[in-house]
Interface confidence: medium
């Protein structure tokens, strides 16, 4: 029962996480115009992985896609790649985990097969979550690094669009969605891996016992019994993931002056 609950919860948490990663990837607000000290503006600028937008005070919003690939900063390309890899791995993980769910019976699928599939999907979710967290963190670090390396006359934007000093960008909602979603996917993956431990079959090697009944002889050999509950002696929960999250400011790498924001 506990295994089914852990597996089911892991699946649901991962599902929510992956939905969040997809949402974050599609969102336009990865970096938003910094409104601190400057709450009233005629236009509000924000940028995503795929396009940049301008919202006028009238409510009219105009977005322009980044129609160049070569002109975009390598860091932005890396973030796109990380998010897409995260989504793909997460989607495959979801597909695999559906068939691995204990509550769903597909033909005469062995518990060992379900355990392997659960572990596979768990690992996929963990990697997916890490990809999303890495992607979002790289982007955040890119924004902050750009600010720390900037001077008054060095403000250029995505794809070479020049910005004035007055347009400064800070963390957008998509970054926070991405961090939370990545974390949820990671947690879901860990739960799937824990559930896998409970699903794993344990060979209970009983000695063959012969029962001599009157009239005829029946030999009962229970050696093939599989313990499929999670309460076996070998169900210690191993720590699957012990990654310490670091803040964007602790990343002390100093990349070259890229032309983003």
């Amino acid at each position: 029962m506990a295994v089914t609950a852990c597996q089911g919860l892991g699946f649901v948490v991962s599902l929510i996480g992956i939905a969040g990663i997809i949402a974050a990837t599609c969102m336009d607000q990865w970096s938003t115009q910094d409104l601190y000290n400057n709450p009233v503006t005629a236009v509000f600028n924000y940028q995503g992985l795929w396009r940049s937008c301008v919202r006028e005070s009238s409510g009219f919003t105009e977005c322009r896609g980044y129609f160049t690939l070569l002109g975009l900063p390598a860091m932005l390309q890396a973030v796109r790649a990380l998010m897409i890899v995260g989504i793909v791995l997460g989607a495959i993980g979801l597909l695999v985990s559906i068939f691995a769910l204990k509550c769903i019976r597909i033909g005469s699928m062995e518990d060992s097969a379900k355990a392997n599939m659960t572990l596979t999907s768990g690992i996929m979710f963990i990697v997916s979550g890490l990809c999303a967290i890495a992607g979002v963190s790289v982007f955040a670090n890119m924004l902050v690094t750009n600010f720390w390396m900037s001077t008054a006359n060095m403000y250029t934007g995505m794809g070479g669009m020049v910005q004035t000093v007055q347009t400064r960008y800070t963390f957008g909602a998509a970054l926070f969605v991405g961090w939370v979603a990545g974390g949820l996917t990671l947690i879901g993956g860990v739960m799937m891996c824990i559930a896998c431990r409970g699903l794993a079959p344990e060979e209970t090697n009983y000695k063959a016992v012969s029962y001599h009944a009157s009239g005829h002889s029946v030999a009962y050999k229970p050696g093939g019994f599989k313990a499929s509950t999670g309460f076996g002696s070998n169900t210690k929960n191993k720590k699957i993931y012990d990654g310490g999250a670091r803040t964007e400011d602790e990343v002390q790498s100093y990349p070259s002056k890229h032309d983003y924001v």
């Epitope: 910094d34 601190y36 000290n37 400057n38 924004l143 902050v144 690094t145 600010f147 720390w148 900037s150 001077t151 008054a152 403000y155 004035t164 000093v165 007055q166 400064r168 800070t170 963390f171 803040t247 964007e248 400011d249 602790e250 990343v251 002390q252």
Partner: antibody, heavy 125, light 107 residues
Framework: QVQLVQSGAEVKKPGASVKVSCEAS????????MHWVRQAPGQGLEWMGI????????NYAQKFQGRVTMTRDTSTSTVYMELSSLRSEDTAVYYC??????????????????WGQGTTVTVSS | DIQMTQSPSSLSASVGDRVTITCRAS??????LGWYQQKPGKAPKRLIY???SLQSGVPSRFSGSGSGTEFTLTISSLQPEDFTTYYC?????????FGQGTELEIR
């Protein structure tokens, strides 16, 4: 309350280096930037640079590039400013000043709200 | 670099007077400006942040206004302790720059 306590006055010879310390207390050390500002006798204020105690990133004024090094020690909540190849024009009062920001709102500096008492550095042969 | 031009460089006034100090930025700095007061032999003290917000503990006779390139500090009714030096600081982009200062003296 928030306090910045700087090291004592220094007298140095031209060509030498000086290292001024600034110990912070009364707030979370890594949640604020630290600036260094100097003031030559009878002159105005001059911004030297900024350090982020969380991570150690720095940005220096072009004038001091290559001569100034700002570091921090999170275990003692102390920021250091080292100025090398001293010349007589470096005779000034050196101030550290806190710049409190909120990473969830914006990581941009918001200006110096609390200042140290100042450290007098005299460069004389 | 962004140049901050502060005017006047010195100003004579009497107790109770209303005075205005101006700071002009060489390019737009949004509202990323602070006003500081410095008494002889002391560290500067912030009076105004974000161009127009009063720092806590600062008397209400001090006020700031402006945005973009033009900023003003107004002292509505001068008190004896206000006769000292004032600086503006832009913290919009590196390198941060101060105005050259305004010395306020008793007439």
């Amino acid at each position: 309350q928030v306090q910045l306590v700087q090291s004592g006055a220094e007298v140095k010879k031209p060509g030498a280096s000086v290292k001024v310390s600034c110990e912070a207390s009364g707030y979370t050390f890594t949640s604020s930037y630290m600036h260094w500002v100097r003031q030559a006798p009878g002159q105005g204020l001059e911004w030297m640079g900024i350090i982020n105690p969380s991570g150690g990133r720095t940005n220096y004024a072009q004038k001091f590039q290559g001569r100034v090094t700002m570091t921090r020690d999170t275990s003692t909540s102390t920021v250091y400013m080292e100025l090398s190849s001293l010349r007589s024009e470096d005779t000034a009062v050196y101030y550290c000043a806190r710049d409190h920001y909120d990473i969830f709102t914006t990581y941009y500096p918001r200006g110096m709200d609390v200042w140290g008492q100042g450290t007098t550095v005299t460069v004389s042969s | 670099d962004i140049q901050m031009t502060q005017s006047p460089s010195s100003l004579s006034a009497s107790v109770g007077d209303r005075v205005t100090i101006t700071c002009r930025a060489s390019q737009g700095i949004r509202n990323d400006l602070g006003w500081y007061q410095q008494k002889p032999g002391k560290a500067p003290k912030r009076l105004i942040y974000a161009a127009s917000s009063l720092q806590s503990g600062v008397p209400s006779r001090f006020s700031g206004s402006g945005s973009g390139t033009e900023f003003t500090l107004t002292i509505s009714s001068l008190q004896p302790e206000d006769f000292t030096t004032y600086y503006c600081l832009q913290h919009n982009s590196f390198p941060f720059t101060f105005g050259q200062g305004t010395e306020l003296e008793i007439r």
